[in-house]
């Protein structure tokens, strides 16, 4: 899945909110997995959604949810209790320079990965941007190559930080270029662990 | 150590596994250092190995091993008990564009830093890729400069995430371009902390 | 910077998240600081605003975090740099960007780099650009140690609570 066409960036990443983020309360149900006792934690692995979107796996490979954490692609990651959480995210991207010379502005792509909070005690209003990273990639063209895409490029955009969260709040990832996400093993993930 | 020549990337990074990783069980021995009680943790600092390899320091500067963690360059980092660990890695890279114009494809280098798991309950088979970051660098060339290397470039490839580990399993770092690693203080490290 | 800056969400500027009231027994030393957006040519760390906080003994003095008790801490920081199209004038030389977390301790007579990243960007050859640097790791710290940052390229920082931050927590 070598992406050459550059998706128009979302003007308001919060609006695009994980393909229609709804903030209704999840039913009180057993966590999907509970692999270890102790502090709430989760590690989710990027997986393609239909229509070139970014979804998340909760059980495959290294993914897990523990101690009451819950997740749905529609609503994001819900932490079961108030506390101080270390949240982290890494999104791998890949693509190709489009064919032909032309305006470099048209070739340049700024990849953004953002972590938002919504719902719960925070209220049903506008999602709140918590942490984000960005990287501008300007694929180098071979000026002699007028046909065909340029060489494949890769980059990763990652970050992590402490956030005070309340029970019922949701955190979710929003990205600017879902068509360029690299779903290879270990490249794209996000997670949370309660540290206090 | 400004690297201009681009090392061919390993087709199977797991195979190149930390300069010949063996998975035999470590003898039950005291940890190399045990500077503080509590949860197992380690922070290892990149150091040059003979033959342009990447090795790791366990005691110099800010490096440490605590509470039964063990490390060897041949076998990687062994965690002393089952649990949830936050694993992290940052590798600084530096280099120079090779001389002369030419095809940008020939100048491009994709730098990969990967964290693998092997051994223990996971079994003696193929190492498992846990987390990985990548960055394609295409050094900007001075088109008129036919002799000498182009300008110096720097970048860092890092990541961190939660992984459920079992006692006896080993984690180790594999990188695509050991000849380009920046060993300056604070630039290249990997580590693990038990969080649950 | 218009067109390339990462804008704080409306929600975050409109209201602050309610403060946590955690039982003291669960508190561990922790801090999360954000870059002061009102100081464009320096990187000044702020607590007690937006989502920034100091908890259970951490304090901020002379732009440094003071470690309250000895132990293992996870320390992290991020910066995001940006540039306008063709903002350099008569040069095609790259811009040097770097961010470092440093330790000043009674054990060392100088600032020791703990976490360090650097990058050369070519603003003369690139359009509006953004570049983030994040790093974090575990360190054994002693009570009274000072954690600070050094940044090359401060005029190019995107100073918002989500993009420029510095924190630590006891493990």
């Amino acid at each position: 899945q070598d992406q050459g066409g550059l998706v128009t960036e979302t003007a308001d990443p919060g609006a695009q909110a994980q393909q229609g983020l709804g903030f209704q309360k999840l039913p009180e149900e057993e966590p999907e997995t509970d692999l270890s006792p102790g502090l709430p934690a989760a590690h989710l692995i990027g997986a393609p959604l239909k229509g070139q979107g970014l979804g998340w796996e909760t059980t495959k490979e290294q993914a897990f949810l523990t101690s009451g954490t819950q997740f749905s692609d529609a609503e994001g990651l819900a932490l079961p209790q108030d506390g101080l959480y270390y949240l982290y995210c890494l999104v791998g991207y890949r693509g190709r320079a489009p064919p032909g010379g032309g305006d470099p502005q048209g070739r340049s792509v700024t990849l953004r990965s953002s972590l938002y909070r919504a719902g719960g005690a925070y209220g049903p209003g506008t999602p709140e941007l918590l942490l984000e990273g960005a990287e501008t990639v300007t694929p180098v063209l071979d000026p002699a190559r007028r046909q065909g895409y340029g060489p494949l490029w890769y980059t990763s955009v990652g970050f992590g930080g402490l956030v005070q969260l309340r029970r019922g709040e949701r955190v979710y990832v929003n990205i600017s270029h879902p068509d360029m996400v690299d779903f290879a093993r270990g490249k794209t993930f996000f997670g949370a662990v309660m540290v206090g | 150590q400004d690297q201009g020549g681009l090392v061919t990337e390993t087709a199977d990074p797991g195979a190149q596994a930390q300069q010949g990783l063996g998975f035999q069980k470590l003898p039950e021995e005291e940890p190399e250092t045990d500077l503080s009680p509590g949860l197992p943790a380690a922070h290892l600092i990149g150091a040059p190995l003979k033959g342009q390899g990447l090795g790791w320091e366990t005691t110099k500067e800010q490096a440490f091993l605590t509470s039964g963690t063990q490390f060897s360059d041949a076998e990687g980092l062994a965690l002393p008990q089952d649990g949830l660990y936050y694993l992290y890695c940052l590798v600084g890279y530096r280099g120079r564009a090779p001389p002369g114009g030419g095809d940008p494809q020939g100048r491009s280098v994709t730098l990969r830093s990967s964290l693998y798991r092997a051994g223990g309950a996971y079994g003696p088979g193929t190492p498992e890729l846990l987390l990985e970051g990548a960055e394609t660098v295409t050094p900007v060339l001075d088109p008129a400069r036919r002799q000498g290397y182009g300008p110096l470039w720097y970048t860092s490839v890092g990541f961190g995430g939660l992984v459920q580990l079992r006692r006896g399993e080993r984690v180790y770092v594999n990188i695509s371009h050991p000849d380009m690693v920046d060993f300056a203080r604070g630039k290249t490290f990997f580590g693990a902390v038990m969080v649950g | 910077l218009p067109g390339v800056g990462l804008t704080p969400s409306a929600a975050q500027t409109a209201r602050q998240h309610p403060k946590m009231h955690l039982a003291h027994s669960t508190l561990k030393p922790a801090a999360h600081l954000i870059g002061d957006p009102s100081k464009q040519n320096s990187l000044l760390w702020r607590a007690n605003t937006d989502r920034a906080f100091l908890q259970d003994g951490f304090s901020l003095s002379n732009n440094s975090l003071l470690v309250p008790t000895s132990g293992i801490y996870f320390v992290y920081s991020q910066v995001v740099f940006s540039g306008k199209a063709y903002s350099p004038k008569a040069t095609s030389s790259p811009l040097y960007l770097a961010h470092e977390v440093q330790l000043f301790s009674s054990q060392y007579p100088f600032h020791v780099p703990l976490l360090s990243s650097q990058k050369m960007v070519y603003p003369g050859l690139q359009e509006p650009w953004l570049h983030s640097m994040y790093h974090g790791a575990a360190f054994q710290l002693t009570q009274g140690d000072q954690l600070s940052t050094h940044t090359d390229g401060i005029p190019h920082l995107v100073l918002s609570p989500s993009t420029v931050f510095f924190g630590a927590f006891a493990l």
């Epitope: 010379g101 305006d103 470099p104 300007t138 180098v140 063209l141 000026p143 | 001075d142 088109p143 008129a144 400069r145 300008p151 110096l152 720097y154 | 040519n41 063709y86 350099p88 004038k89 008569a90 040069t91 095609s92 030389s93 790259p94 811009l95 040097y96 960007l97 770097a98 650097q118 050369m120 003369g124 050859l125 690139q126 359009e127 090359d152 390229g153 401060i154 005029p155 190019h156």
Partner: antibody
Framework: QGQLQQSGAELMKPGASVKISCKAT????????IEWVKQRPGHGLEWIGE????????NYNEEFKGKATFTADKSSNTAYIQLSSLTSEDSAVYYC???????WGQGTTLTVSS | DIVMSQSPSSLAVSVGEKVTMSCKSS????????????LAWYQQKPGQSPKLLIY???TRDSGVPDRFTGSGSGTDFTLTISSVKAEDLAVYYC?????????FGGGTKLEIK
């Protein structure tokens, strides 16, 4: 608005070395390259080379390799050029410049005479 | 090295006249990736350091009067002063920053009649 302030005129003997300073004020210069330019009467402007104060990276004009050495001190926001084995050919006005912002120093006159 | 040639080496004009001076490079200064010409023009008044007038071949520096215009692409560039003033007495240099080493033209000396 930034400025580059250079050290004063120097009178040196042949064979000696001299170090000229260039202090950036009004901005932090560590991310931007400081260039050095030589101007002799009737010779126009010659580019000696440049230094990145943050990284310490340098680029020299081949014609000045062995003659000029660049250093920089980030803490004092100052760049330096050292000229060694001075001869009368080195008598000139030396300028420092920051091409990113378009700033130039006022120039330092070096006279080499026995 | 890229050789920069300026012409004329000097010219004398009256106040209010239009002036054009030429700068030619021994190879193209147009960077294909971003379609920018890596050329600057400097003004050096007697006893002063050079002052940046134009960069990217045609972008006027802040504070530079609009009577100064840079034009051209590739290897041929022109600096035009639409209506010369007495304070424009100076030597004008072009410089390429496309390649190392950076090189300057020999200068055009503008004298006022």
């Amino acid at each position: 608005q930034g400025q580059l302030q250079q050290s004063g005129a120097e009178l040196m003997k042949p064979g000696a070395s001299v170090k000229i300073s260039c202090k950036a004020t009004g901005y932090t210069f560590s991310s931007y390259w400081i260039e050095w330019v030589k101007q002799r009467p009737g010779h126009g402007l010659e580019w000696i080379g440049e230094i990145s104060p943050g990284s310490g990276s340098t680029n020299y004009n081949e014609e000045f390799k062995g003659k000029a050495t660049f250093t920089a001190d980030k803490s004092s926001n100052t760049a330096y050029i050292q000229l060694s084995s001075l001869t009368s050919e080195d008598s000139a006005v030396y300028y420092c410049a920051d091409g990113y912002h378009g700033y130039w120093g006022q120039g330092t006159t070096l006279t080499v005479s026995s | 090295d890229i050789v920069m040639s300026q012409s004329p080496s000097s010219l004398a004009v009256s106040v209010g006249e239009k002036v054009t001076m030429s700068c030619k490079s021994s190879q193209s200064l147009l960077y294909s990736t971003n379609q920018k010409n890596f050329l600057a023009w400097y003004q050096q008044k007697p006893g002063q350091s050079p002052k940046l007038l134009i960069y990217w071949a045609s972008t006027r520096d802040s504070g530079v009067p609009d009577r100064f215009t840079g034009s051209g692409s590739g290897t041929d560039f022109t600096l035009t002063i639409s209506s010369v003033k007495a304070e424009d007495l100076a030597v004008y240099y072009c410089q390429q920053y496309y390649s190392y080493p950076r090189t300057f033209g020999g200068g055009t000396k503008l004298e006022i009649k």
